[in-house]
């Protein structure tokens, strides 16, 4: 029998080892053992949580996130005449979601096939880099959008080229920052072959030396710098925004804006509660437990939290809906299988028949689309 090496490895959650002994499978075939995981990690890697629940959630995210963010990006780039800062941030948000979601078919196949990665090391690194990159990009662009929304209420000045240029500059800086902070994820070997389970994992099993200190320090830094600080800014912007809206005079138009602002705040809050807070909190707790105890009892929660973090790609379109008039129109018409051009023509014909602009609405047999907002 061939002796395995004595290097050590560790499961993403707990202790895995490189066996220095020969390994005989249940079928009696002796093979060289390279990486090994403990019973808990093995049960997770072969269990329904990772092979059924995760692919179901990722399929939902892919089916909802790809078309909605694709449409959003198309609307923001080609169907929005004035490129306000909000539009620029939302376009970047949609792009970040798309860059993450396009890889989901590979992720779904990986989990369905028992956490077995067959697409090579480079694709695994791209998938993981984009996975985390999307989460932190979403947080930062959401922060920019939130601060910008507040700024618009405080400073309701017209659109200026300068503001758009600042927004583009900030967006480029965010992409550069995310690229830099995710470099470690691209550099680290993410694929590990586990002979005992006959699978090659992608990110689910990582070397012990890396896990014990480095991963904890890495995700703690990200949680503080790219989650807590932006979360504080976002929360501040919305608290101040609510104060401003409360104190402002209320006509019908202001009331609609206020309602949309509240819906936006609720959506962003939901995103933080469902997607960003659990994942960032559990990333830190999980790696802290590995560092301090050599094992993580919150592994299942950690997996679920990371999985739920991808739902931001489904929640983001609601943000676009509450912020962008153009996206709202396209979304409504896409859902009603109508082209915007048809609706615009009907609006024109309705107004030409001297219908009041305030109450102008287009009634179809199925629903009514208000066009006066």
């Amino acid at each position: 029998t061939i002796q395995g090496t004595n290097r050590s490895s560790k499961g993403r959650s707990l202790i895995g080892k490189v066996d220095g002994t020969s390994h005989v499978t249940g079928k009696g075939v002796t093979v060289e053992t390279v990486f090994s995981v403990d019973e808990f990690s093995a049960s997770v890697l072969t269990g329904k949580l990772t092979t059924v629940f995760l692919p179901i959630v990722y399929t939902i995210v892919f089916v909802v996130g790809l078309p909605s963010n694709g449409m959003a990006l198309w609307v923001f780039l080609f169907r929005t005449k004035k490129k306000h800062p909000a539009v620029i941030y939302m376009a970047n948000l949609a792009l970040a979601d798309l860059l993450s979601v396009i890889w989901f078919p590979l992720k779904i196949a990986y989990h369905i096939h028992g956490n077995n990665w067959i697409y090579g090391e480079a694709l695994c690194n791209v998938l993981i880099g984009f996975f985390y990159g999307n989460m932190y990009c979403s947080i930062l662009f959401m922060t920019c959008l939130s601060v910008q929304r507040y700024w618009v209420i405080v400073n309701p000045m017209g659109h200026s080229r300068k503001k758009a240029n600042i927004a583009i500059g900030i967006s480029l800086a965010i992409w550069l920052l995310i690229l830099l902070v995710t470099i470690p994820l691209y550099v680290v070997k993410q694929t590990i072959f586990i002979p005992a389970l006959n699978i090659t994992t992608c990110h689910d099993v990582l070397p012990e030396q890396l896990l014990v200190g480095d991963m904890f320090n890495y995700f703690l830094s990200l949680a503080i710098g790219v989650f807590l600080f932006p979360a504080f800014l976002t929360a501040s912007a919305y608290v101040l925004m609510i104060r401003m809206l409360r104190s402002s005079a209320m006509d019908e138009n202001s009331e609609k804006k206020r309602k949309r602002a509240i819906k936006l705040i609720v959506t962003v809050l939901a995103m933080y509660l469902i997607c960003f807070t659990p994942s960032n909190l559990l990333l830190v707790v999980h790696y802290f437990l590995i560092k301090s105890q050599g094992q993580s009892h919150v592994y299942a929660l950690y997996i679920v939290a990371l999985c739920l973090s991808t739902l931001n790609s489904c929640i983001d379109p609601f943000v676009y809906y509450f912020v962008s008039h153009d996206f709202r129109d396209h979304a409504k018409n896409a859902l009603l299988c109508r082209s915007v051009r048809t609706v615009k023509q009907m609006q024109v014909s309705l107004t030409s028949k001297k219908h009041s602009r305030k109450s102008s609405s287009y009634s179809s047999s199925s629903t009514t689309v208000k066009t006066s907002y």
Epitope: G4, N6, R7, S8, G11, S13, L14, I15, G16, K17, V18, D19, G20, T21, H23, V24, T25, G26, K27, S36, V37, D38, E39, F40, S41, A42, S43, T46, A196, L197, E208, Q209, V212, S292, Q293, G294, Q295, S296, H297
Partner: antibody, heavy 121, light 107 residues
Framework: EVQLVESGGGLVQPKGSLKLSCAAS????????MHWVRQAPGKGLEWVAR??????????YYADSVKDRFTISRDDSQNMLYLQMNNLKTEDTAMYYC????????????WGQGTTLTVSS | DIVMTQSHKFMSTSLGDRVSITCKAS??????VAWHQQKPGQSPKVLIY???NRHTGVPDRFTGSGSGTDFTLTISNVQSEDLADYFC?????????FGSGTKLEIK
């Protein structure tokens, strides 16, 4: 309460065979990896063999000193662990302990009280 | 295989004293070290895992420390029931290996 009770030890002649048993109770036996560890009289502890759970296809591991002579097996329905020892040598004389591996891979967490094997002519 | 060396075969102490038992690994094992206590005529029991974490029910006078290659088990306020053999063990890689043991005695 976790309990591991070994049995089957005794006096055997060199080149003889013997099967040790370990009855497990107080935990979900089929989800844990199990080990045999031995301790020669007045000596230190030596790992002998390991068997994984069904999840990992009952994979088995052996120390070089017992490879091809000892076979570790388990019966999950009976909560039993076994060590079949063939072609015994005098240096196999020791106290044999049945040990549970921590579910999270953190070394061993429970030891049995041991059973004595004496190999002598 | 990784060799675990416990340089002191015996250590003498007085009741109520503090004693430190050391263990050295032949190569880096990270924090994957456990300490086992074996009282005369009994089977071993786990005291410490992952270098510094006490196993369930282990009194807090037992503390483990170290990482890499050097590890220490410290018993503060030694009690009569602590008189036993203490073995370190690495589980960084297979085969798991043990130190030769340190016998704690009363002066």
């Amino acid at each position: 309460e976790v309990q591991l009770v070994e049995s089957g030890g005794g006096l055997v002649q060199p080149k003889g065979s013997l099967k040790l048993s370990c009855a497990a109770s107080g935990f979900t036996f089929n989800t844990y990896a199990m080990h045999w560890v031995r301790q020669a009289p007045g000596k230190g502890l030596e790992w002998v063999a390991r068997i994984r759970s069904k999840n990992v296809h009952y994979a088995t591991y052996y120390a070089d000193s017992v490879k091809d002579r000892f076979t570790i097996s388990r019966d999950d329905s009976q909560n039993m662990l076994y060590l079949q020892m063939n072609n015994l040598k005098t240096e196999d004389t020791a106290m044999y302990y049945c040990v549970r591996e921590d579910y999270y891979g953190s070394s061993y967490d429970y030891w049995g009280q041991g059973t004595t094997l004496t190999v002598s002519s | 295989d990784i060799v675990m060396t416990q340089s002191h075969k015996f250590m003498s102490t007085s009741l109520g004293d503090r004693v430190s038992i050391t263990c050295k690994a032949s190569q880096d094992v990270g924090s994957a070290v456990a300490w086992h206590q074996q009282k005369p005529g009994q089977s071993p029991k786990v005291l410490i895992y992952w270098a510094s974490n006490r196993h369930t029910g282990v009194p807090d006078r037992f503390t483990g420390s170290g990482s890499g290659t050097d590890f220490t088990l410290t018993i503060s306020n030694v009690q009569s029931e602590d008189l036993a053999d203490y073995f370190c063990q690495q589980y960084s890689s297979y085969p798991f290996t043990f130190g030769s043991g340190t016998k704690l005695e009363i002066k």
